[in-house]
Structures are given as C-alpha cells and as structure tokens.
Amino acid sequence: MNGRVDYLVTEEEINLTRGPSGLGFNIVGGTDQQYVSNDSGIYVSRIKENGAAALDGRLQEGDKILSVNGQDLKNLLHQDAVDLFRNAGYAVSLRVQHRLQVQNGPIGHRGEGDPSG
C-alpha cells in the first residue's frame, strides 16, 4: 500500500554574490513552459558545481524562486525570467520556496489534496 506523502513548505531569502561565471544555476518554468502542472512558476533545475549558488549552499534543485531583487516572478515567459536573472546585477536577492518531503503516513482517502497543487 502506498502512503500519503506530506510536504513541509518553507520560504527563505537567499543573498548571492555573482561569481566569475555568474550565479551558477539553471531554471525551468514560465507561462510558456509549465514545469509543474497548473503552475507557471520558476523552478531551479540544476546547481552548477563550484558556482555561486553551490558555494552558498542554500539554493537546492526543485526550489521555486518567487522573486529576484524584490521583483515577482509570477506570469513571466521563460526567456523573460532568464533575462531577469542575467540582468540582476552583482548582488542578487532571491526569495525561494523549499518543499521538503517530511513523512509517509498511512494511506489517505481518495480525493485528498494533491501536494503538487
């Protein structure tokens, strides 16, 4: 029997300093590239080894980036989001949402909330 998967969602402000090769991560998502069903948000898909994000250690693959330097990432085309990061300057403040799997409980009733919703 499959258990229900529960998630703990937390938000964090991460301040990165752009390194010699940039911020050091990849993103997916946008209104024209939905990565998660019914969610056009921007998600981290890769952390580059030895890049600024990896050296900082807080940003993780799968994190949702809510804003960059206070600018909301809602309803952006994918390339517009990429360009926003590229033009964000030397000191970059990211508001991110971490989603951690915390337990496998007993099987839930059919129709319970989908954690990806």
Partner: nanobody, 125 residues
Framework: EVQLVESGGGLVQAGGSLRLSCTAS????????MAWFRQAPGKEREFVAA??????YYADSVKGRFTISRDNAKNTMYLQMNSLKPEDTAVYIC?????????????????????WGQGTQVTVS
C-alpha cells in the same frame, strides 16, 4: 536520470546527407537545453550545434550545412547534415541539461551539460 540514445549514423559519400536523432527519456523534454558534439579519432571533442528554449547555435564549420531541430512530442532532437565533407567524419554525441542557465550561455562548453549519449558514427568517404 536522463538517458540519451543517438541513431542515424552511417557511411555516406561526400556531398551526401544524413539525419541524426537523439531520443531522450524524461517527461520534461521540452525544457532540456540540448547539443551535438563530435569527436574524430585522435582529436578533441568539438561542438557542432545546440538548441535552447530561445534559439539555435552552430559551429562556424557547419553553419549553412547542418540544421538542429527538435520534436518535443517525440522526445527527440535531430541534426540534419547536408553537403557532408570527409572532415565531418566523427562519432556524433548528443548532450543535454535540464533547463536554461541563468548565466551567460556557452553552447560549446561541455560543462554546460549533465547528460551524454554514447554516440553514433558518421563516416564521409
């Protein structure tokens, strides 16, 4: 883990054409940044072409002769190679990474990619 499988290589005469395919696993293929590299015996791996969400990139040596494209419904990327020359002889290798870099993209840098295929041999006589 993304798996990449190339096909379509073979022996062709100079001036001829081939179409290579690279089929990938994964439900989010449309988000992949993908590239073709090639390696001839005794030579360094060389960038050929790349395709991102926003465009395509080519090595000067293949510009105007090769065309990179993708079919997201088939989880497949293609390399149409026309006007082939003997110097195009190599093993052609597909590479991919999930998403778009937020940094300056260097399509020819192998460190941009996380996943690599085994390659398909192209011989131009």
């Amino acid at each position: 883990e993304v798996q990449l499988v190339e096909s379509g290589g073979g022996l062709v005469q100079a001036g001829g054409s081939l179409r290579l395919s690279c089929t990938a696993s994964g439900r989010t293929f449309s988000t992949y940044t993908m590239a073709w590299f090639r390696q001839a015996p005794g030579k360094e791996r060389e960038f050929v072409a790349a395709i991102t969400w926003s465009g395509t990139y080519y090595a000067d040596s293949v510009k105007g002769r090769f065309t990179i494209s993708r079919d997201n419904a088939k989880n497949t990327m293609y390399l149409q190679m026309n006007s082939l020359k003997p110097e195009d002889t190599a093993v052609y290798i597909c590479a991919a990474v999930i998403g778009s870099t937020v940094d300056s993209y260097s399509p020819s840098d192998p460190l941009e990619y996380d996943y690599w295929g085994q390659g398909t041999q192209v011989t131009v006589s």
